[in-house]
């Protein structure tokens, strides 16, 4: 199915806004810059989430699935 991943309406995609606090969903809060898809070599970088590339820094970051936290969405959020 072409839409098997979380739909953009619900996955926190807008967390890329330069002035938005993204601590809940990305590896850094108030991260500046723009995003693209992570290169293929990062296919499994995010354990429970979607990888996106910080264009200006050329580094991967993760948008975690609901209920997961951590730099690579590797930890269950006990407060979820």
């Amino acid at each position: 199915d072409g839409n098997s991943t979380r739909s953009p309406e619900t996955n926190g995609l807008l967390c890329g806004d330069p002035d938005e606090n993204c601590a809940a969903t990305t590896t850094q809060s108030k991260r500046k810059g723009h995003f693209s898809r992570c290169p293929k070599q990062y296919k499994h970088y995010c354990i429970k989430g979607r990888c996106r590339f910080v264009v200006t820094e050329q580094t991967p970051s993760c948008v975690c699935d609901e209920g997961y936290i951590g730099a690579r969405c590797e930890r269950v959020d006990l407060f979820y």
Partner: antibody, heavy 119, light 107 residues
Framework: QVQLLESGGGLVQPGGSLRLSCAAS????????MSWVRQAPGKGLEWVSG???????TYTDSVKGRFTISRDNSKNTLYLQMNSLRAEDTAVYYC?????????????WGQGTLVTVSS | SYELTQPLSVSVALGQTARITCSGD??????VHWYQQKPGQAPVLVIY???DRPSGIPERFSGSNSGNTATLTISRAQAGDEADYYC?????????FGGGTKLTVLG
């Protein structure tokens, strides 16, 4: 249903300008990156420009400095301002939705609008 | 800049298997997507991420990607499969398309 509808194409002289519009419906327009892709008569597809959901823009080399991509999320509309048009810009221009961020694939396309640059 | 090379045309007999290739330097390290375009119509995504099929695309369409070549395979080719097919990848913050392949279904 999810739909993209381009408009604004037509005949323009070399050196002239044109603004294309792409009206989106059936999805949360502001959440998606969008792109323009063109196809010259009898030729293949050529990506022209892309615009991220937070304003990041990127262009193919041949249109840099001449074309400007923009969006109005309140109107669910994508634009392509084309200046200093050349004969080689003659093509059908398609508006396409990038799946999620840049770097994915185009999962929704409009039907295209024809731009003809000729004297 | 990155280039994707496709054969200009491929012919297949009705009911047989067609294979369309897309060549590029270390293309296996990139995600490759395939679009079908019929005359006078907009392109339609038929394969994404090398081998995944969007909903509504028949199982006869499949893809693979390794080394320097990505391949779109169309099994049990039908007359309605006759179209132009384009591969696409992402390189250095820009989109790259192959030149396109015209698939002709014979018989």
């Amino acid at each position: 249903q999810v739909q993209l509808l381009e408009s604004g194409g037509g005949l323009v002289q070399p050196g002239g300008s044109l603004r294309l519009s792409c009206a989106a419906s059936g999805f949360t327009f502001s959440s998606y990156a969008m792109s323009w892709v063109r196809q010259a008569p009898g030729k293949g597809l050529e990506w022209v420009s892309g615009l991220g959901h937070v304003g990041y823009t990127t262009y193919t080399d041949s249109v840099k400095g001449r074309f400007t991509i923009s969006r109005d999320n309140s109107k669910n509309t994508l634009y392509l301002q084309m200046n200093s048009l050349r004969a080689e810009d003659t093509a059908v221009y398609y508006c396409a939705r990038d799946y999620l961020d840049f770097g994915y694939y185009f999962d929704v396309w409009g039907q295209g609008t024809l731009v003809t640059v000729s004297s | 800049s990155y280039e994707l090379t496709q054969p200009l045309s491929v012919s297949v007999a009705l009911g047989q298997t067609a294979r369309i290739t897309c060549s590029g330097d270390k293309i296996g390290k990139k995600y490759v997507h395939w679009y079908q375009q019929k005359p006078g119509q907009a392109p339609v995504l038929v394969i994404y991420d090398d081998s995944d099929r969007p909903s509504g695309i028949p199982e006869r369409f499949s893809g693979s990607n390794s080394g320097n070549t990505a391949t779109l395979t169309i099994s049990r080719a039908q007359a309605g499969d006759e179209a132009d097919y384009y591969c696409q990848a992402w390189d250095m913050q820009s989109v790259v398309f192959g030149g396109g392949t015209k698939l002709t279904v014979l018989g």
